[in-house]
């Protein structure tokens, strides 16, 4: 029997009865928050063999081993994970061993076994036999191995029953409990599973099987399960579902899950029955079960219940992430914020259409509206009083609307209104009239020529660069000396530069009025000699990297009531010279015959130019005499060379580490102080632990059902 779509057993241990007939849990299994210690010996679920997602155990009092509960749990598929983990055992106060002696495969994800004060038999399990990669496993804060004294079956009687493997240079017996060995299949089976009698299963089996070489006798399937058979792919007219079985179209059409209730139902795409079309695809019609590729970003319609969505913070903008069509009105009122321009672009940058009006008022944090980088249509189906569909009022630092050279914006209905935007040049507004098709709609008072742009240098002259010189990490540039009508109005120059892999940056990218700016800025004083052209040396740059650079003249912005002329350059793109690349990464060598070595590597992280070739050097080394000191045909334990790793087990530090013996005849000496790197690593570790614990609590503590 398949049970699903995830089973949450909490508070009352008798809820475990829900697992009675389950052979596969299609979803997760949570057993948690059972605070009263119970006797679990009468609960046993031998039918359960597979969990398709993850297993989470948290604060279950009185439970000492999982082996009695789930004696035949063989596979945890990890189709969906709990914070990257397929098996989480956290704060299980009484758990003495894991005991899942039939667990053979965790298909995806890692394990996290943490803060289980009584838990032993952790170092005796070879997780590499169960998981593909053990590097992400997190086993911390359990009973110290020295206090455990884990013994595998038969070791006391000197008749060891379990097989040995090497973990961290330790060649040892592998077991789950004092009387259960860790099962290993004969090497002849290769990657295949095996029966209890060590006969190899069918290649499509995963974990184990009841009969050899039979695709109907598998405990679990390597790929997919269909009509009692393990198959490498789903047969025609059936579709992959939840990563493990094949279902028909009708099943897929009828799925109504709590997770997908708001959607239009499951879809069939690329041979899979899934909750939504994948990224880059959209339903072929609103109620279709099939997906087609999107042209450009996939449309996502967002609607505001109250008709008008107020954007007054990053949090409110976050609600619009991914939206391409906004049904309603946008009221933007951003007075302050950190890194606001790029945050707004992140959450609102995909909006293409607003069906109502757009109103921007008191948004003193905004320098530009370029964060609405895909807005192309304001329909004006709803308008403000006075028939305005684009309304810009009192934005003290707004300097640019959009980059009109690269922007096509249409306002289908309604007028525009601009007032009290002291840094917004009227020429910018007039340009918007032309581009948006609203020219002629506005009456005289709609664009106030006195209080828009009153504190900006609006009639800009163009500064021209006169020379550029590059090296691997420097750029030297000079430009024409700017001469305003009154030379006293010119104060200095500011050079703006940043990395620009593509020639598509604008002056206002990532800029807001609260100090955030994606451009680096350098002030350049006027050369005292009037005939010398101003210039700058930009240093500390990356080799073979394209930079965008522009220069602005810093001028007095008000002379009585007249607007004065400012000056700035076009954006110049310039690339630094190439340099020596960093070292190639992950060099591996292996011998595939007596006269050949195969050497592999990855490209350097910093190529610092176009790589044209690699140089491989090698030299012969004298043979290691150590290899001849042992008779490898003897059945004795092969000697393992142990290298001191220089780390101290936190739990083993004595009361007074200063008297620690530092080896040889040196006598007592001080423990070395931690390096900055070690301190940083510990800090990150602690942070990571906190993040996981928060995630756990947020996920499992839910309001009590009615």
């Amino acid at each position: 029997e398949i049970c699903g779509p995830g089973i949450d057993i909490r508070n009352d241990y008798q809820q475990l009865k829900r697992l009675e007939n389950c052979t596969v849990i299609e979803g997760y299994l949570h057993i948690l928050l059972i605070s009263k210690a119970e006797d679990y010996r009468s609960y046993r679920f031998p039918k359960l063999t597979v969990i398709t997602e993850y297993l989470l155990l948290f604060r279950v009092a009185g439970l000492e081993s999982l082996g009695d509960l789930f004696p035949n749990l063989t596979v945890i598929r990890g189709w969906k994970l709990f914070y990257n983990y397929a098996l989480v055992i956290f704060e299980m106060t009484n758990l003495k061993d894991i005991g899942l002696y039939n667990l053979r495969n965790i298909t995806r994800g890692a394990i996290r076994i943490e803060k289980n004060a009584d838990l032993c038999y952790l170092s005796t399990v070879d997780w590499s036999l169960i998981l593909d990669a053990v590097s992400n496993n997190y086993i911390v804060g359990n009973k110290p191995p020295k206090e455990c004294g884990d013994l595998c079956p038969g070791t006391m009687e000197e008749k060891p029953m379990c097989e040995k493997t090497t973990i961290n240079n330790e060649y040892n017996y592998r077991c789950w409990t004092t009387n259960r060995c860790q099962k290993m299949c004969p090497s002849t089976c290769g990657k295949r599973a095996c029966t209890e009698n060590n006969e190899c299963c069918h290649p499509e089996c995963l974990g184990s099987c009841s009969a050899p070489d039979n695709d109907t006798a598998c405990v679990a399937c390597r790929h997919y399960y269909y009509a009692g058979v393990c198959v490498p792919a789903c047969p025609p007219n059936t579709y992959r579902f939840e990563g493990w079985r094949c279902v028909d179209r009708d099943f897929c059409a009828n799925i109504l899950s709590a997770e997908s209730s708001d959607s239009e139902g499951f879809v069939i795409h690329d041979g899979e029955c899934m909750q939504e079309c994948p990224s880059g695809f959209i339903r072929n019609g609103s109620q279709s079960m099939y997906c087609i590729p999107c042209e450009g970003p996939c449309p996502k319609v967002c609607e505001e219940e109250k008709k008008t969505k107020t954007i007054d913070s990053v949090t409110s903008a976050q609600m619009l992430q991914g939206c391409t069509i906004f049904k309603g009105n946008l009221l933007i009122n951003i007075r302050r914020g950190n890194n606001i321009a790029s945050e707004l672009e992140n959450f609102m940058g995909l909006i293409e259409v607003v069906t109502g009006y757009v109103k921007i008022r008191h948004s003193h944090a905004l320098v530009s509206l370029s964060f609405l980088k895909n807005l192309r249509l304001i329909l004006g189906e709803e308008q403000l009083e006075g028939n305005y569909s684009f309304y810009v009022l009192d934005n003290q630092n707004l300097q640019q609307l959009w980059d009109w050279d690269h922007r096509n914006l249409t306002i289908k209905a309604g007028k525009m209104y601009f007032a009290f935007n002291p840094k917004l040049c009227v020429s910018e507004i007039y340009r918007m009239e032309e581009v948006t098709g609203t020219k002629g709609r506005q009456s005289k008072g709609d664009i106030n020529t006195r209080n828009n742009g009153e504190r900006a240098s609006c009639e800009s002259d163009v500064l021209h660069f006169t020379s550029t010189t590059t090296s691997k990490n420097r750029i030297i540039i000079t430009w024409h000396r700017y001469r305003p009508p009154d030379y006293r109005d010119l104060i200095s120059f500011t050079v703006y530069y940043k990395e620009a892999p593509f020639k598509n940056v604008t002056e206002y990218d990532g800029q807001d009025a609260c100090g955030s700016n994606s451009w680096n800025m350098v002030d350049v004083d006027l050369p005292p000699n009037k005939d010398v052209e101003p210039g700058i040396l930009l240093h500390g740059l990356k080799p073979w990297t394209q930079y965008a650079v522009y220069v602005k003249a810093v001028t007095l912005t008000m002379v009585e009531n007249d607007h004065i002329r400012g000056a700035k350059s076009e954006i110049l793109y310039i690339r630094t010279n190439a340099s020596v690349p960093s070292i190639p990464l992950d060099v591996l060598s292996a011998s595939n015959s007596s006269s050949q070595l195969i050497v592999k590597w990855n490209p350097p992280s910093l190529p610092n130019g176009n790589l044209s070739y690699y140089i491989v050097r090698w030299q012969r080394q004298p043979q290691d005499g150590y290899l001849y000191r042992h008779n490898y045909c003897s059945k004795d334990k092969i000697p393992i060379r142990k290298y001191a790793d220089g780390t101290i087990d936190i739990e083993e530090v004595t009361e007074n580490p200063k008297t620690e013996v530092c080896g040889g005849e040196k006598g007592p000496c001080c423990a070395c102080p931690k390096t900055e790197a070690e301190k940083q690593a510990e800090k990150e570790e602690a942070e990571y632990r906190k993040v996981f614990e928060n995630f756990l609590h947020n996920s499992i503590f839910v309001p009590r059902p009615e």
């Epitope: 029997e1 398949i2 049970c3 699903g4 779509p5 995830g6 089973i7 949450d8 829900r18 007939n21 389950c22 979803g27 099943f251 059409a253 009828n254 799925i255 109504l256 899950s257 709590a258 997770e259 997908s260 209730s261 239009e264 139902g265 609103s286 109620q287 059902p705 009615e706």
Partner: antibody
């Protein structure tokens, strides 16, 4: 895989309350779907009574609304029907069934409830 | 409530011959999302109903292709191209487009 099993008294006296429980195995009733009660008087057609959804919301047939309550016990993975003030006209085979986005996909085998003094 | 009216109420058939059952709704059963949630169920003697057709014309996987559904708006039809002995039972149409959901009164198909 999913199984539904109706249980409850087979005989109810007129004016009393009919109580039935549907025990679901193989699927968590909070995980999705609408969990329905349908009845069929002897020799007659099927009549939809109402449902409780995965999220606890209800929908009832208007003509029965004043007398019917469908509730659930998530810890036991069960949902229940209570029909008050019963008369002989409420004698029927009562089915519980699961409805997804489009159709009823699993039914119980039905339980006969007779209203008689 | 939407009333679903089936005809005929009884349909004696000869094996191998075609059969047709009509189902009319008292108002349109097109859902606001554009779908028409009309299904046909067969209830064999002593059993729970089983689904044959959903969303007017989609035959359930495993249902013989002699069964087909058609119609739109308020008029729907279930056809059996060649009746077989195992097809006997009561056929119900059902609408799940508008609450309260409603069944037709049933059509009894029996072998002549």
């Amino acid at each position: 895989q999913v199984q539904l099993q109706e249980s409850g008294p087979g005989l109810v006296k007129p004016s009393e309350t009919l109580s039935l429980t549907c025990t679901v195995s193989g699927y968590s009733i909070t995980g999705g779907y609408h969990w329905n009660w349908i009845r069929q008087p002897p020799g007659k057609g099927l009549e939809w009574i109402g449902y409780i959804s995965y999220d606890g919301t209800n929908n009832y047939k208007p003509s029965l609304k004043d007398r019917v309550t469908i509730s659930r016990d998530t810890s036991k993975n069960q949902f229940s029907l209570k029909l008050s003030s019963v008369t002989a006209a409420d004698t029927a085979v009562y089915y519980c069934a699961r409805y997804g986005r489009v159709f009823f996909d699993y039914w119980g085998q039905g339980t006969l409830v007779t209203v008689s003094s | 409530d939407i009333v679903m009216t089936q005809s005929p109420l009884s349909l004696p058939v000869t094996p191998g011959e075609p059969a047709s059952i009509s189902c009319r709704s008292s108002q349109s059963i097109v859902h606001s999302n554009g779908n028409t949630y009309l299904q046909w169920y067969l209830q064999k003697p002593g059993q729970s109903p089983q689904l044959l057709i959903y969303k007017v014309s989609n035959r359930l996987y495993g249902v013989p292709d002699r069964f087909s559904g058609s119609g739109s708006g308020t008029d729907f039809t279930l056809k059996i191209s060649r009746v077989e002995a195992e097809d006997v039972g009561v056929y119900y149409c059902f609408q799940g487009s508008h609450v309260p959901w409603t069944f037709g009164q049933g059509t009894k198909v029996e072998i002549k």
